[in-house]
């Protein structure tokens, strides 16, 4: 053998010549092919392309390509097709994740909850309750909690403070004469701006992907009290109505602005596709379909001493 060795030098395998009993060192065949004729002491090995429905992933010294896995079982879809270089790989479609060898839909975070961690093809969505100053007004498996609309930046005032489930409602001040117009820092409301109302309908539930804290453990029961209590704000089931009354008494001429249709609204709903896994906490091993009647489907799948 020549002394020179290069990192990309083709590999070799050993083969016993049946005619002579000689142990020969032959060049491996490239990925996507197999050895159709072994080398002899006068001729190089011969490689042939893998027939349709078979593959070899690496350079090899094997006499037959591996059978591809069977077609993906519903509802899985093909991530990689069966080709000369690759086995068929199955994955869950967008919006679903691998669960017990099938696909389950991503958890939908209910109103008042947002996506903490996007779902992937191998992991479910993780939900979290919307923190102070944020809200989620639609059930979604892709939307994060959105920040309240900043009324002041639009030269508006907060008429109805946002909750975990609703945005701030902004409005305009009545026309004041120059002598009575409020100064920029003047408080307009008798109640704090981030007043939170916790009107949780009895139907509200916490799906398996939800967390009441930032930990990775998934809550499987409804939280005792929504996180505002943990944040130190006592829920007040009457505050919403009373607040509205107070506002209306104090500022009878306020105009309510439907900012969700106005040009300044920044909470436009966008449905985002589920992100593909780039190797997460769960197994990122590609899912294979069952093999076609080959006993080697079990442990050392496709292992061959002559294919590395």
């Amino acid at each position: 053998q020549p002394e020179q060795k290069a990192s990309n030098l083709i590999g070799t395998y050993r083969h016993v010549d049946r005619a002579t009993g000689q142990v020969l060192t032959c060049d491996k065949c490239p990925a996507g092919t197999y050895v159709s004729e072994h080398c002899t002491n006068t001729s190089l090995r011969v490689c042939s392309s893998c027939p349709v429905g078979t593959f070899t992933r690496h350079e090899n010294g094997i006499e037959k390509c591996h059978d591809c896995s069977q077609p993906c079982p519903w509802p899985m879809i093909e991530k990689l097709p069966c080709a000369a270089l690759t086995d068929r790989e199955c994955t869950c479609p967008p919006g679903m994740f691998q669960s017990n060898a099938t696909c389950a839909p991503h958890t939908v975070c209910p109103v008042g909850w947002g996506v903490r961690k996007k779902g992937t093809e191998t992991e479910d969505v993780r939900c979290k309750q919307c923190a102070r100053g944020t809200f989620s007004d639609v059930p979604s498996s892709v939307m994060k909690c959105k920040a309240y609309t900043d009324c002041l930046s639009q030269n508006l005032v907060v008429i109805k403070p946002g909750t975990k489930e609703t945005d701030n409602v902004c409005g305009t001040l009545p026309s004041f004469s120059s002598s009575t117009s409020p100064s920029p820092g003047t408080a307009i409301f008798p109640r704090p701006e981030h007043m939170e109302t916790h009107e949780v309908p009895s139907s509200t539930y916490v799906p398996k992907g939800m967390n009441s804290t930032e930990s990775n453990s998934s809550a499987s029961v409804r939280p005792k009290v929504l996180s505002s209590i943990q944040e130190g704000t006592v829920p007040d089931n009457t505050s919403s109505a009373r607040g509205k009354e107070d506002v209306n008494k104090t500022l009878p001429n306020l105009q309510v602005v439907n900012h969700q249709q106005g040009p300044h609204h920044r909470h436009i709903l966008k449905l985002l596709p589920s992100m593909e896994a780039t190797g997460g906490e769960k197994s990122s091993t590609p899912i294979k379909g069952p093999k076609r009647g080959h006993p080697r489907q079990n442990l050392h799948k496709h292992f061959d001493i002559n294919e590395h």
Partner: antibody, heavy 117, light 110 residues
Framework: EVQLLESGGGLVQPGGSLRLSCAAS????????MTWVRQAPGKGLEWVSS????????WYADSVKGRFTISRDNSKNTLYLQMNSLRAEDTAVYYC??????????WGQGTLVTVSS | QSELTQPPSASGSPGQSVTISCTGT?????????ISWFQQHPGKAPKLMIY???KRPSGVPDRFSGSKSDNTASLTVSGLQAEDEADYYC??????????FGGGTKLTVL
């Protein structure tokens, strides 16, 4: 002594055909792959085609694929090259060479093929 | 198949050494230690001088040696003699039973 003797070259018009032969002697022909190499006048060597010992597999340079066919008759110790649809650029000396594993260890003296109208 | 790259000419005085390079790619020279060198005198058939990078067939003087680094092979002729004046061709196996030749180097003994 290993000997390879090519024959069958000559003058042919564009689009015409020729069949080259290479008679092998002085060694056991059947275990060796065989190869045709050509050399245009004043130019370098160009690999043309190879065939495995059994004759069951053949390979061709892109420049001749679909027009040339390599074959062998192990009982006659002879290698062939059937050349169809000849072009001016096929004009060359054609050598047959014994292929010992990866290298051409013995060459014939060559036969000249001229494609011209 | 693109040919390997050789310098068109090389020269040296009798007794000197000269090295001819042959550059290919990772698909041919870089992938296999199957580099051969041929000597061809005008009007003659090529003669094998080196095979498998650095092996000499019987009958070839040990003044001829070969080497390879990455994608480049080299032929060195030391102690140049007048009869060494010829064309030299490198060739590399390129996989799939295909071979690629260099364009040839004309070696002149001054």
């Amino acid at each position: 002594e290993v000997q390879l003797l090519e024959s069958g070259g000559g003058l042919v018009q564009p689009g015409g055909s020729l069949r080259l032969s290479c008679a092998a002697s002085g060694f056991t022909f059947s275990p060796y792959s065989m190869t045709w190499v050509r050399q245009a006048p004043g130019k370098g060597l160009e690999w043309v085609s190879s065939i495995v010992p059994s004759g069951g597999k053949t390979w061709y340079a892109d420049s001749v694929k679909g027009r040339f066919t390599i074959s062998r008759d192990n009982s006659k110790n002879t290698l062939y090259l059937q050349m169809n649809s000849l072009r001016a650029e096929d004009t060359a000396v054609y050598y047959c060479a014994r292929t010992n594993l990866s290298y051409f260890d013995y060459w014939g003296q060559g036969t000249l093929v001229t494609v011209s109208s | 198949q693109s040919e390997l790259t050789q310098p068109p000419s090389a020269s040296g005085s009798p007794g000197q050494s000269v090295t001819i390079s042959c550059t290919g790619t990772s698909n041919d020279v870089g992938s296999y230690n199957y580099i051969s060198w041929f000597q061809q005198h005008p009007g003659k058939a090529p003669k094998l001088m080196i095979y498998e990078v650095n092996k000499r067939p019987s009958g070839v003087p040990d003044r001829f040696s070969g080497s390879k680094s990455d994608n480049t092979a080299s032929l060195t002729v030391s102690g140049l003699q007048a009869e060494d004046e010829a064309d030299y061709y490198c060739t590399s196996y390129a996989g799939s039973h295909k071979w690629v030749f260099g364009g040839g180097t004309k070696l002149t003994v001054l």
